[in-house]
């Protein structure tokens, strides 16, 4: 008996071939011997089966001795043994119809779980293997679960159902709702304008929700809400903003915040959360601000950084075009009695300068100038 696998919702074509290459009488029946369709001369006739409106054949092939049964919009319950009667012969074909669906919406928040459920006919014992867009394989029986979805899980999942050494492939498009970056860090000199951007890693027709940026300044004992906003069809409207600092927010996506001035008291870490309509849970993006200040007080030239710096970073003070006078893994370095000239304060990571601030040291009788 030939086995054919079909996909729920698809169309399947079951073949039946006569030895004579001409149009002769044929019938297709199900296992209950109920006629599905056949022919009467060059006409297609249909029986009283449940498939009536979904069954068809290809009349153009009859002259070649081919009498296929075409079943459209397959259902799991179409799984059955189909018998083709032609030339006093019976050809049996076992059709097994499978369906694979995502448990919920195919738009899931980062960190949520994806469950894929296999619908299969009674008596079948299929195995399923799914490959994620990033190449990760998961195996299972009737259900497959992937916990903690990541951004790289967005895309087409390819699932193969194996039964009787035959296979059928399903493709499911999954969209993981997340920010493009889980975390970002902005390095600024004191007084510079700060731009925070929160690009989303997905596009949808309509995007509605609400968000908030909480900020934990390094110098503060507790975090505070800097801004709250609403999102309606990709339009941003600010609901509330703190007085200090006075943040500005762009009206369109991507979410964009401007801090007028980088100041030591603002250095720290923020967490932007976005709750989307009809979704449980929130999207998160961490943002960090590091602020540098170079100052000269009397005979002491000091360079300081505030904010979440890594212990691998090196802070240096050097006179322009000269060797570093001091270079330490600290958040503050200083030089006593600095010689006159343009001094550079550098925050670097393995040679990559992340932040630079220049300060001009004038001869001792003058006062310093900060460019």
């Amino acid at each position: 008996k030939k086995v054919v696998l079909g996909k729920k919702g698809d169309t399947v074509e079951l073949t039946c071939t006569a030895s004579q290459k001409k149009s002769i009488q044929f019938h297709w029946k199900n296992s209950n011997q109920i006629k599905i369709l056949g022919n009467q001369g060059s006409f297609l006739t249909k029986g009283p089966s449940k498939l009536n409106d979904r069954a068809d054949s290809r009349r153009s092939l009859w002259d070649q001795g081919n009498f296929p049964l075409i079943i459209k919009n397959l259902k799991i319950e179409d799984s059955d043994t189909y018998i083709c009667e032609v030339e006093d012969q019976k050809e049996e074909v076992q059709l097994l119809v499978f369906g694979l669906t995502a448990n919920s919406d195919t738009h899931l928040l980062q960190g949520q779980s994806l469950t894929l459920t296999l619908e299969s006919p009674p008596g079948s014992s299929p195995s399923v293997q799914c490959r994620s867009p990033r190449g990760k394989n998961i195996q299972g029986g009737k259900t497959l679960s992937v916990s903690q979805l990541e951004l790289q899980d967005s895309g087409t999942w390819t699932c193969t159902v194996l039964q009787n050494q035959k296979k059928v492939e399903f493709k499911i498009d999954i969209v993981v709702l997340a920010f493009q970056k889980a975390s970002s860090i902005v390095y600024k000199k004191e007084g510079e304008q700060v731009e925070f951007s929160f690009p989303l890693a997905f596009t949808v027709e309509k995007l509605t929700g609400s968000g908030e940026l909480w900020w934990q300044a390094e110098r503060a004992s507790s975090s505070k809400s800097w801004i709250t906003f609403d999102l309606k069809n990709k339009e941003v409207s600010v609901k509330r903003v703190t007085q200090d600092p006075k943040l500005q927010m762009g009206k369109k996506l991507p979410l964009h915040l401007t801090l007028p001035q980088a100041l030591p008291q603002y250095a720290g870490s923020g967490n932007l959360t976005l709750a989307l309509e009809a979704k449980t849970g929130k999207l998160h993006q961490e943002v960090n601000l590091v602020v540098m200040r170079a100052t000269q007080l009397q005979k002491n030239l000091t360079c300081e950084v505030w904010g979440p710096t890594s212990p691998k970073l090196m802070l240096s003070l050097k006179l322009e075009n000269k060797e570093a006078k001091v270079s330490k893994r600290e958040k503050a370095v200083w030089v006593l009695n600095p010689e006159a000239g343009m001094w550079q304060c550098l925050l670097s990571d393995s040679g990559q300068v992340l932040l630079e601030s220049n300060i001009k040291v004038l001869p001792t009788w003058s006062t310093p100038v900060q460019p």
Epitope: P311, M314, S327, Q352
Partner: antibody, heavy 117, light 113 residues
């Protein structure tokens, strides 16, 4: 697994230059600095400088300033250390080493440079 | 530059016994900003490059046997081999990476008594 593979031994005359290569594999080349450390026969370890694989920035020890040049080729994940105006006291094994924070977690096998007339 | 001084220059210890190597820096290598000691220990066997054993003064590199431990803070540091094995015969170096340039101690040769 990160690997640093250095070029073979060299014999040079005083006043000449030597160029030693160090090819990195098994890691993200651009995310760290490569340091050069030398060891004279029976002696301790001496730092020559580093080159950032990310952007080619260099930092040389004051002692070797003007005599040492470090370069990189990102297409082959290779860094080079050239030491000029060689003298007999430059005879040593030269090592390249990966630096993630300041300590050196992976080292090349070493290249013996002999300076002799 | 920070000067690193190791003691003793050489050390002979019986198999299974404890070996202790000291390292002193000319200035503190403890970062007040990050509360970390920027000190590493290396092992070097003849004809081989140095091998990282300990960093942050006391964090063991992965794959390093737990008989090796590092301690100390500020300017005084110790590498301890709790039970010396034959394969531990080598020269041991300390290195500071708190300030540039990084500097090494002169080395301590560990032998079997």
């Amino acid at each position: 697994q990160v690997q640093l593979v250095q070029s073979g031994a060299e014999v040079k005359k005083p006043g000449a230059s030597v160029k030693v290569s160090c090819k990195a594999s098994g890691g993200t080349f651009s995310s760290y600095a490569i340091n050069w450390v030398r060891q004279a026969p029976g002696q301790g370890l001496e730092w020559l400088g580093w080159i950032s694989a990310y952007n080619g920035n260099t930092n040389y020890a004051q002692k070797f300033q003007g005599r040492v040049t470090m370069t990189r080729d990102t297409s082959t994940s290779t860094v080079y250390m050239e030491l000029s105006s060689l003298r007999s006291e430059d005879t040593a094994v030269y090592y390249c080493a990966r630096d993630l924070v300041g300590h050196f977690d992976y080292w090349g096998q070493g290249t013996l440079v002999t300076v002799s007339s | 530059d920070i000067v690193m001084t190791q003691s003793p220059d050489s050390l002979a210890v019986s198999l299974g016994e404890r070996a202790t190597i000291n390292c002193k820096s000319s200035q503190s290598v403890l970062s007040s900003s990050y509360n970390k000691n920027y000190l590493a220990w290396y092992q070097q066997k003849p004809g081989q490059p140095p091998k990282l054993l300990i960093y942050w003064a006391s964090t063991r590199e992965s794959g390093v046997p737990d008989r090796f431990s590092g301690s100390g803070s500020g300017t005084d540091f110790t590498l301890t081999i709790s039970s010396l094995q034959a394969e531990d015969v080598a020269v041991y170096y300390c290195q500071q990476y708190y300030s540039s340039p990084p500097t090494f101690g002169g080395g301590t040769k560990v032998e079997i008594k």
